[in-house]
């Protein structure tokens, strides 16, 4: 999906009003020195691409993020504020239902959510002139 035509300000508002708080709750009890961000993004569409990938694509050691509250709210925000996003996700959602597993918060998941927080920070305030 190409995130170029999303309403970035509305997505930012959704993030700041609820998603950010859910991420903080997920990370509660984790030391702020624990994880170094290794995933970065250069502009808002790129940031959303990386956010979508880390939030919804299962990775080795962390298969369950898509069922978390912050993930569901992220999905809702993208569906509302990114034209045509919902249609591209139907097949992906069906595939996810087939491999649904119980929620387990692993250290790998905590690291991944720390990366997500970093990506959202860059989405909210990209360093490039074109904001």
């Amino acid at each position: 999906y190409d995130f170029t035509n999303c309403d970035f300000e509305k997505i930012k508002a959704a993030y700041l009003s609820t998603i950010s708080k859910d991420l903080i709750t997920y990370m509660s009890g984790t030391k702020s020195t624990e994880f170094n961000n290794t995933v970065s993004c250069s502009n808002r569409p790129h940031c959303l691409t990386e956010i979508q990938s880390l939030t919804f694509n299962p990775t080795a050691g962390c298969a369950s993020l898509a069922k978390e509250m912050f993930a569901m709210k992220t999905k809702a925000a993208l569906a509302i504020w990114c034209p045509g996003y919902s249609e591209t996700q139907i097949n992906a959602t069906q595939a996810m239902k087939k491999r649904r597993k119980r929620k387990v918060t692993t250290n790998k998941c905590l690291e991944q959510v720390s990366q997500l927080q970093g990506l959202w920070r860059r989405f909210n305030r990209p360093l490039l002139k074109q904001q």
């Epitope: 300000e9 702020s32 994880f35 961000n37 970065s40 720390s114 959202w120 920070r121 360093l127 002139k129």
Partner: antibody, heavy 119, light 107 residues
């Protein structure tokens, strides 16, 4: 506990350079932007620029472009602001600050470094 | 550059009374406005981010509102510890810019 500790006061001659350091602790240094802001005596706040310590990306206020250089050393968790071609109007308190967890504000500030430019 | 204009530049308030500071942007900054307080002899400290969100530990008597070009910081009941200079800041466009500051004194 997050802390930003800045270097001590400096007295400089016009035309010279100054390098102010900002040592961070209590968080993953490379994960958060470091901002630089200055405040002339009795005046308001003026943004100088920002650096991403993770990759070295910077953005400067045009008013300081060519004179200000922001760098970061991940090995020591220290950010630096160097200002060259100093003039008397550069006399100010220089602050470093860290972006907050959402990327929309500065949540921790250094104690400030007084730079006096005088002949 | 986006110019942030604060009014009034100073105000003197009786403890327990309300106070209000206005901040106007020269062009729309969406909701990308932050409020800081600089107490005498100290570094600035974060109060409100993204127009109306309280930073951790900031008392409920502080509130922010507005969008686009007009923003307001309100203190419902001023206390002695609230003295200092209040700054609004926009982070919608580079360069980031601050208002000129509003000095709050206690009567």
């Amino acid at each position: 506990e997050v802390q930003l500790v800045q270097s001590g006061a400096e007295v400089k001659k016009p035309g010279s350079s100054v390098k102010v350091s900002c040592k961070a602790s209590g968080y993953a240094f490379s994960n958060y932007l470091i901002e630089w802001v200055r405040q002339a005596p009795g005046q308001g706040l003026e943004w100088i620029g920002v650096i991403d310590p993770g990759n070295g990306d910077t953005n400067y206020n045009e008013n300081f472009k060519g004179r200000a250089t922001l760098t970061a050393d991940k090995s020591t968790s220290t950010a630096y602001m160097e200002l060259s071609s100093l003039r008397s109007e550069d006399t100010a308190v220089y602050y470093c600050a860290r972006e907050d967890n959402t990327g929309t504000a500065f949540d921790y500030w250094g104690q400030g470094t007084t730079v006096t430019v005088s002949s | 550059d986006i110019v942030m204009t604060q009014t009034p530049l100073s105000l003197s308030v009786t403890p327990g009374q309300p106070a209000s500071i206005s901040c106007k942007a020269s062009q729309s900054v969406s909701s990308d406005v932050t409020w800081y307080l600089q107490k005498p002899g100290q570094s600035p400290q974060l109060l409100i981010y993204y127009v109306s969100n309280h930073y951790t530990g900031v008392p409920d008597r502080f509130s922010g509102s507005g969008s686009g070009t007009d923003f307001t910081l309100k203190i419902s009941r001023v206390e002695a510890e609230d003295v200092g200079v209040y700054y609004c800041q926009q982070h919608h466009r580079f360069p980031l810019t601050f208002g000129q500051g509003t000095k709050l004194e206690i009567k």
